[in-house]
Interface confidence: low
């Protein structure tokens, strides 16, 4: 498939707070956002993140399958027994002002087409597209049991989409993303990504004070 | 003063979407969030950001006084005539669940005390403290005309506060931040910062598509 096998690239997901809007999804209390910035990851031979990541000063932490930290930071004694799979990704977008709202059905169809054709993600993994102007939410869901050999991972699809939206396309020699709904350009001004793991993350209550 | 003179440290501000809650502030449409991740900044001899920043591959952009990008990225022909001042900062926090909501007056007083005593920020620059459980918003305002010699810059105070909240205190040889309201620990689980400049930022409509 053409979307990345090397999910280790996913280093730029951004942080956000949940929305309280009516038709939008409220991220789970266990949802992760990447607020650690960039780091130089350890990858296994297949290009997956190693469950434990450490920096040059031997501070270590556990990550999920998209490389986002899911534990407190510790020292070299920290153990990460398994790479926990991210099975639900919520991509939260805010589009630039338009003459009117996009038609929800048209928007839904266009985004599903995009994930199918550009990122080669099987349509069954795009669980929902929510819209309340100017916020769009795309839900990707993919359990371990659902993912067959050759299926693009939702983490890879989300990462390629994120980079496309930011005008930093990872597709060599292909045009940048020109996203349109019924001919009207869809211009994204903010992208926020939440990751939900099959096993809830483990943070102490006191980690930030 | 003990808070940083070197505002060039401010590299980790995070991105978010505006809140629609009743008693909370809605950031201006011109508010900036730093969604570019870390970069190695050019600083002037006084430790201020140079108006133009470029990365190692010579992509350049203009920044404000807290180092957040305020123009589209361009090439080496890009000119940034002046360092535009950030005069309004909105710090948006979400605290961890507590038995009940904090008393707004107590919370307001404690945060004002913290900014005055720990970050040496003159009380007149803390414009407001808003609270709607679990969201706290601290508004800092400081026009060029208001800032006297020796006054701590709101950008420095915000940066030191952000690092304290994240358990990464920049105060050498002083204890970490133990924030309490009437003895009850205030544990922050998410921090989002918006920056508003004296001159609105200049982004093209098409910058992300």
């Amino acid at each position: 498939h053409t979307a990345a096998q090397d999910n280790c690239l996913l280093l730029k997901a951004r942080m956000s707070a949940p929305k309280n809007a009516r038709t939008l999804v409220r991220p789970s209390e266990h949802a992760l956002v990447d607020n650690d910035g960039l780091y130089d990851p350890d990858c296994d031979p297949e290009g997956r993140f190693k469950a434990r990541q450490c920096n040059q000063t031997s501070v270590c932490w556990c990550v999920n399958s998209v490389g986002v930290r899911r534990t407190d930071k510790g020292d070299l004694s920290l153990r990460c027994d398994e790479l926990v799979r991210t099975h639900h990704i919520l991509i939260d977008l805010r589009h630039r002002p338009t003459a009117g709202a996009f038609n929800h059905s048209d928007l839904d169809a266009e985004l599903r087409r995009l994930f199918r054709e550009r990122y080669r993600l099987h349509p069954k993994f795009v669980a929902a597209v929510h819209y309340e102007q100017p916020t769009i939410q795309i839900e990707l869901r993919q359990n371990t049991s659902q993912k067959a050999a050759g299926d693009v991972d939702i983490g890879d699809a989300a990462y390629y989409f994120e980079r496309d939206i930011k005008g930093e396309s990872l597709f060599q020699g292909r045009g940048g993303l020109d996203l349109r709904v019924r001919g009207e350009p869809l211009q994204v001004e903010r992208t926020l990504i939440y990751y939900l793991d099959e096993i809830p993350p483990k943070f102490s209550m006191k980690r930030l004070t | 003063h003990t808070a940083a003179q070197d505002n060039c440290l401010l590299l980790k501000a995070r991105m978010s979407a505006p809140k629609n809650a009743r008693t909370l502030v809605r950031p201006s449409e011109h508010a900036l969030v730093d969604n570019d991740g870390l970069y190695d900044p050019d600083c002037d001899p006084e430790g201020r950001f140079k108006a133009r920043q470029c990365n190692q591959t010579s992509v350049c952009w203009c920044v404000n006084s807290v180092g957040v990008r305020r123009t589209d990225k361009g090439d080496l022909s890009l000119r940034c005539d002046e360092l535009v001042r950030t005069h309004h900062i909105l710090i948006d926090l979400r605290h961890r669940p507590t038995a009940g909501a904090f008393n707004h007056s107590d919370l307001d007083a404690e945060l004002r005390r913290l900014f005055r005593e720990r970050y040496r920020l003159h009380p007149k620059f803390v414009a407001a403290v808003h609270y709607e459980q679990p969201t706290i918003q601290i508004e800092l305002r400081q026009n060029t005309s208001q800032k006297a010699a020796g006054d701590v810059d709101i950008g420095d105070a915000a940066y030191y506060f952000e690092r304290d909240i994240k358990g990464e205190s920049l105060f050498q040889g002083r204890g970490g931040l133990d924030l309490r309201v009437r003895g009850e620990p205030l544990q922050v689980e998410r921090t989002l910062i918006y920056y508003l400049d004296e001159i609105p930022p200049k982004f093209s409509m098409k910058r992300l598509t």
């Epitope: 930093e168 | 050019d42 591959t57 010579s58 992509v59 350049c60 990225k73 090439d75 080496l76």
Partner: antibody, heavy 121, light 107 residues
């Protein structure tokens, strides 16, 4: 492999026009800007300007505004430098160099072999 | 325009020597300086960009340093094939400008 192949040497008279070519191969032509650099005999390197290979928009250094023109034939992955109303001081070797814009590499990582233009009456 | 000044037009050296070439910018160019090697009858070849980053495939005997206005290019152990003209170039702002070049020759 990545290379820039320039057209052969030119001998011209003052007042004539010359058009030299630079054909790119081994990479996506429109992903990198094309720069032109002049080197007079026994002298150093002088940046003439560049052309945005995505949009075709040229940018000229002050000294090279007027008689000099950059152009493209994108389908052939080729950039051109045309010099009108040639003068003796245009005698030089002209190099094309791959550079960039946007995600910008403004040093030149790939160079053509150079085209020598001699202007003599 | 930013002027790049290479103080030595010629430098004499011997095989195995360490040699440093300096370049001074007329104004602050951060770390945006590249170094090129040009041999007679050939096109220039980039060795260093962004002051200290060695371009792909360039031997590690070539190093660069500096920031702001003062830059240095060093060959730790000169080899016969290193005899050439070396140019600095600022890639900070257009118009891009080169130094006049320093010719490295044998003593």
């Amino acid at each position: 492999q990545i290379q820039l192949v320039q057209s052969g040497p030119e001998l011209k008279k003052p007042g004539e026009t010359v058009k030299i070519s630079c054909k790119a191969s081994g990479y996506t032509f429109t992903n990198y800007g094309m720069n032109w650099v002049k080197q007079a005999p026994g002298k150093g390197l002088k940046w003439m300007g560049w052309i945005n290979t995505k949009t075709g928009e040229p940018t000229y250094a002050e000294e090279f505004k007027g008689r000099f023109a950059f152009s493209l034939e994108t389908s052939a992955s080729t950039a051109y430098l045309q010099i009108n109303n040639l003068k003796k001081e245009d005698t030089a070797t002209y190099f094309c160099g791959r550079g960039g814009y946007g995600s910008s590499y403004w040093y030149f990582d790939v160079w053509g072999a150079g085209t020598t233009v001699t202007v003599s009456s | 325009d930013i002027v790049m000044t290479q103080s030595h037009k010629f430098m004499s050296t011997s095989v195995g020597d360490r040699v440093s070439i300096t370049c001074k910018a007329s104004q602050d160019v951060s770390i945006a300086v590249a170094w090129y090697q040009q041999k007679p009858g050939q096109s220039p070849k980039v060795l260093i960009y962004s002051a200290s980053y060695r371009y792909t495939g360039v031997p590690d005997r070539f190093t660069g340093s500096g920031s702001g206005t003062d830059f240095t290019f060093t060959i730790s152990r000169v080899q016969a094939e290193d005899l050439a003209v070396y140019y600095c170039q600022q890639h900070y702002i257009t118009p891009l400008t080169f130094g006049a070049g320093t010719k490295l020759e044998l003593k």
